[in-house]
Amino acid sequence: AITEAREEAKPYPLFPGPLPGSLQTDHTSLLSLPHTSGYQPALMFSPTQPGRPYTGNVAIPRVTSAGSKLLPPLAFKHTVGHIILSEHKDVKFNCSISVPNIYQDTTISWWKDGKELLGAHHAITQFYPDDEVTAIIASFSITSVQRSDNGSYICKMKINNEEIVSDPIYIEVQGLPHFTKQPESMNVTRNTAFNLTCQAVGPPEPVNIFWVQNSSRVNEQPEKSPSVLTVPGLTEMAVFSCEAHNDKGLTVSKGVQINIKAIPSPPTEVSIHNSTAHSILISWVPGFDGYSPFRNCSVQVKEVDPLSNGSVMIFNTSASPHMYQIKQLQALANYSIGVSCMNEIGWSAVSPWILASTTEGAPSVAPLNVTVFLNESRDNVDIRWMKPLTKRQAGELVGYRISHVWQSAGISKELLEEVGQNNSRAQISVQVHNATCTVRIAAVTKGGVGPFSDPVKIFIPAHGWVDHAPSSTPAPGNA
């Protein structure tokens, strides 16, 4: 995502003024002696190395040599204080100190930014023993330096519970600008201003920013990092990037697409999943959201009937799931259904309309003039009724359902009988004597069972009694 010009490339002479010092890599030329160890010191003897005494953290030995003169204060010799180098170069630096031979177990440790460097670092300590002192050179090398190697390095040595600390060696790894904040893709409202941010760091500093929109530079002069670009508004999609320049060259951010929010595309593939007499379950595939989340959808339903007034029923629903059960429809009717969805910008066009039908409904009225007689000789109950006046939408009558409930002395049981559509009378066997029989009848179509008639009760006496119950509902005109 990040493209980098080569370090040598300086395509745009942006930066007047003094340049940082030339690259320094090998500041110390270490003698190749056999007495070396990887971080593990060993006392040996060799001539003292000359060096300017360090006046900071100094250990002053109390021991006298030859019983008379005091030993000089112990201090690390001064070395290079600041090393500037390019990324991926190698660097080696060292600390040196001369230690009187009276001290045993001298260990030099390396520290970076206050933390001890342990483990697999390229630290080598060399010893040059002499009669009275041992010169110790601790070197630290880094191959192919990275920005993370930037920092302040010091040597520490412990002698007699005293700690001697070297001057810091500051390593500055320079390279192409490194982005800490890049512009982000956004979806924006048409002709509305918005901001983009770009931030890059060195070293070397300063880092200067150029903004690029659709391959054209927005600012012809650089802006110091961090830079905020106020885009005055867009009418169409645009691609933005920023260029970060420093003395090493330039780094280009990822290009980000800024999209313009628009009304959504209409939904597609409206499908019927299930139809009942009074409801239809539909689903749809949402169209493109116009770079703005869907808020809700609208299901539009028109009855397809030459006699209907052509009005549209509108049902609002959430944008997801992409499914809706349309209710309160008429049975056995044809409908045209379309779906539209909205985002913050507005409503989409309506999807292609699809046709759907509801199934037959159940009857809406109960059979009329229900009468119940006890036929003692046959030990059954005779039931008669009149066919209900059903609407077309209820579909074709397929029969009747008779409910008879027998109640006596705390016992109650309901039985159901089905009879064909051509019948308007039925006989049921007496189930219990000295009991009440309650009869209700409902018409049945393919769409289901209609409402039951009002209950008609008849008392079934012990043998020898006769009773007659009037009809449950008077026939029209028989008032």
Epitope: S216, Q221, L229
Partner: antibody, heavy 118, light 106 residues
Framework: QIQLVQSGPELKKPGETVKISCKAS????????MNWVKQAPGKGLKWMGW????????TYADDFKGRFAFSLETSASTAYLQINNLKNEDLATYFC???????????WGQGTLVTVSA | QIVLSQSPAILSASPGEKVTMTCRAS?????MHWYQQKSGSSPKPWIY???NLASGVPARFSGSGSGTSYSLTISRVEAEDAATYFC?????????FGAGTKLELK
């Protein structure tokens, strides 16, 4: 407040050289490039090019390459337009204007009329 | 280079009238700026980046457009609006200006 103040009118003969100044105040001079725009009498505006006030690098529109030179005196926050070997068609008012984002010329000098007459 | 064609060259209007002037580009541009210039003065920044009014510009001015077609509209012209209006494109070097539309009041 930001101001661009240009030098006064110039009357020159063909073949001579003229140098117009544009002194900026009210902002950091090196933050914005400086454009030069030509307007012949009764005509429209024509962009001549610009100078990067940070680096001093000039950019010239094709019609203004050769006899025209943009320069700076950064310490004095001043930009200059020099026209060498003046011709009759150089008779015009020359404007300096700051270069903002999207090449928006937010601030203009009052203009310098250069008359070329034998 | 992109050529900007402004029309009409001269626009005559009565105070209170609504007027629109257009600027067509020979190729698509990202933004159009507009400047107002009165006789003997330097151009004044008027509309920035297609539709943003510069500081101090009355709200009766508006700008719109995209691609190759841009316009400046004055909802109710006033006497002080008499001037020449120049468009200038951003998006392709060299920067170019239109020849101007001169608004005259009847």
């Amino acid at each position: 407040q930001i101001q661009l103040v240009q030098s006064g009118p110039e009357l020159k003969k063909p073949g001579e050289t003229v140098k117009i100044s544009c002194k900026a105040s009210g902002y950091t001079f090196t933050n914005y490039g400086m454009n030069w725009v030509k307007q012949a009498p009764g005509k429209g505006l024509k962009w001549m090019g610009w100078i990067n006030t940070y680096t001093g690098e000039p950019t010239y529109a094709d019609d203004f390459k050769g006899r025209f030179a943009f320069s700076l005196e950064t310490s004095a926050s001043t930009a200059y337009l020099q026209i060498n070997n003046l011709k009759n068609e150089d008779l015009a008012t020359y404007f300096c204007a700051t270069y903002g984002h999207y090449a928006w010329f937010a601030y203009w000098g009052q203009g310098t009329l250069v008359t070329v007459s034998a | 280079q992109i050529v900007l064609s402004q029309s009409p060259a001269i626009l005559s209007a009565s105070p209170g009238e609504k007027v629109t002037m257009t600027c067509r580009a020979s190729s698509s541009v990202s933004y159009m700026h507009w400047y107002q210039q009165k006789s003997g003065s330097s151009p004044k920044p008027w509309i920035y980046a297609t539709s943003n009014l510069a500081s101090g510009v009355p709200a009766r001015f508006s700008g719109s457009g995209s691609g190759t077609s841009y316009s400046l509209t004055i909802s109710r012209v006033e006497a002080e609006d008499a001037a020449t209006y120049f468009c200038q494109q951003w998006g392709t070097k060299p920067l170019t200006f239109g020849a101007g539309t001169k608004l005259e009041l009847k």
